[in-house]
């Protein structure tokens, strides 16, 4: 499946919105820094393209889940959050449509279960961290910066997939 060019633009807009959402300086939150253990190896180049789509979808869906909680709504600017949701939703739709376009060809298993579980556990660690830090402004800033980093890495995978074609 060829992810549309708009998907790439959407990824860049998502990163831009995440940057705009910053409310406090990360430097004032150094004591709250945390290593969430992003499973970077699950986004490596060893996958077939069909197998990466569910992993990318998982990443975006989990970001959407994380930022659509009541606690998140209270932490961020509502206008930026709505724009952010729109971008994530469009990317999920693109990836979903990709699976449907695969009909008629030999359908590869969607399950790269280890990779998907690794992504889920990563987001569980983030959720647990936020709870432990009582959803403080610094905790949210640390998480925002982390999501920017991990989303950027997963976006790079998408780009490498496109360049492979």
């Amino acid at each position: 499946c060829d992810l549309p060019q708009t998907h790439s633009l959407g990824s860049r807009r998502t990163l831009m919105l995440l940057a705009q959402m910053r409310r406090i300086s990360l430097f004032s939150c150094l004591k709250d820094r945390h290593d969430f253990g992003f499973p970077q190896e699950e986004f490596g180049n060893q996958f077939q393209k069909a197998e990466t789509i569910p992993v990318l979808h998982e990443m975006i869906q989990q970001i959407f889940n994380l930022f659509s909680t009541k606690d998140s709504s209270a932490a961020w600017d509502e206008t930026l959050l709505d724009k952010f949701y729109t971008e994530l939703y469009q990317q999920l739709n693109d990836l979903e449509a990709c699976v449907i376009q695969g009909v008629g060809v030999t359908e590869t298993p969607l399950m790269k279960e280890d990779s998907i579980l690794a992504v889920r556990k990563y987001f569980q660690r983030i959720t647990l961290y936020l709870k432990e830090k009582k959803y403080s402004p610094c905790a949210w800033e640390v998480v925002r910066a982390e999501i920017m980093r991990s989303f950027s890495l997963s976006t790079n995978l998408q780009e490498s997939l496109r360049s492979k074609e």
Partner: antibody, heavy 126, light 110 residues
């Protein structure tokens, strides 16, 4: 686990409108769509439409366009179905249904209905 | 728009027997996007099989799903008394999102 609780039974006149509500509790996310599915007496299931509460984005089945409106509140997470210009054949049990965040992989999550409300009977009668 | 046709309409079987239910699509459907539900009288539907062949939580392993393209099956290896119900297949297509149900197959006690 998600629990979906629908409003009570309604009796309506032909030509009028009905509004059914569905309140979600438990492990809910406004980032997953809530759908409405109906079942006429002794008949099969029919998808009517869905809403993504986080954005208010709606999608409606062709059969209902023009007389269906689905809305939602994010807190507490509640979806509403409004059906206008009611006809006798709209007599049915109306279910709200949602996916599960636990489905692996999540790309399948929004394609199915893991959780269902108890159903709300709407009777159209003169 | 995709049409799902289920057959047979009714299946009369005894407990302990096996059952094979068919769901035929009017056009190709990704097996990943084919789901089966069970509905007992007076109850809401219950998710049974998703992704064509994955069992939902708590579903016994006597239920299995298979097929691809336009032909899908739900197999119950040995019917238990609690299995008698109406079974629906459902497909998903996007964009825009459309959910389609088959008309149902009733599995009744012979």
């Amino acid at each position: 686990e998600v629990q979906l609780l629908e409003s009570g039974a309604e009796v309506k006149r032909p030509g009028s409108s009905v509004r059914v509500s569905c309140r979600a509790s438990g492990d809910t996310f406004s980032s997953y769509p809530i759908s409405w599915v109906r079942q006429a007496p002794g008949q099969g299931l029919e998808w009517m439409g869905r809403i993504l509460p986080a954005l208010g984005v709606t999608n409606y089945a062709q059969n209902f366009r023009g007389r269906i409106t689905i809305t939602a509140d994010k807190s507490p997470l509640t979806a509403y179905l409004e059906l206008s210009s009611l006809r006798f054949e709209d007599t049915a049990v109306y279910y709200c249904a949602s996916p599960s965040a636990d489905i692996i992989p999540s790309i399948l999550g929004t394609t199915l209905f893991a959780f269902w409300g108890q159903g709300s009977l709407v009777t159209v009668s003169s | 728009e995709i049409v799902l046709t289920q057959s047979p309409g009714t299946l009369s079987l005894s407990p302990g027997e096996g059952a094979t239910l068919s769901c035929r699509a009017s056009q190709n459907v990704s097996r990943h996007y084919l789901t089966w539900y069970q509905q007992k009288p007076g109850q809401s539907p219950r998710l049974l099989i998703y992704g064509g062949s994955s069992r939902a939580t708590g579903v016994p392993d006597r239920f299995s799903g298979g097929g691809s393209g336009t032909d899908f099956t739900l197999t119950i290896s040995r019917l238990e008394p609690e299995d008698f119900a109406v079974f629906y297949c459902q497909s998903y297509h996007s964009p825009p999102p459309v959910y389609t149900f088959g008309q149902g197959t009733k599995v009744e006690i012979k």
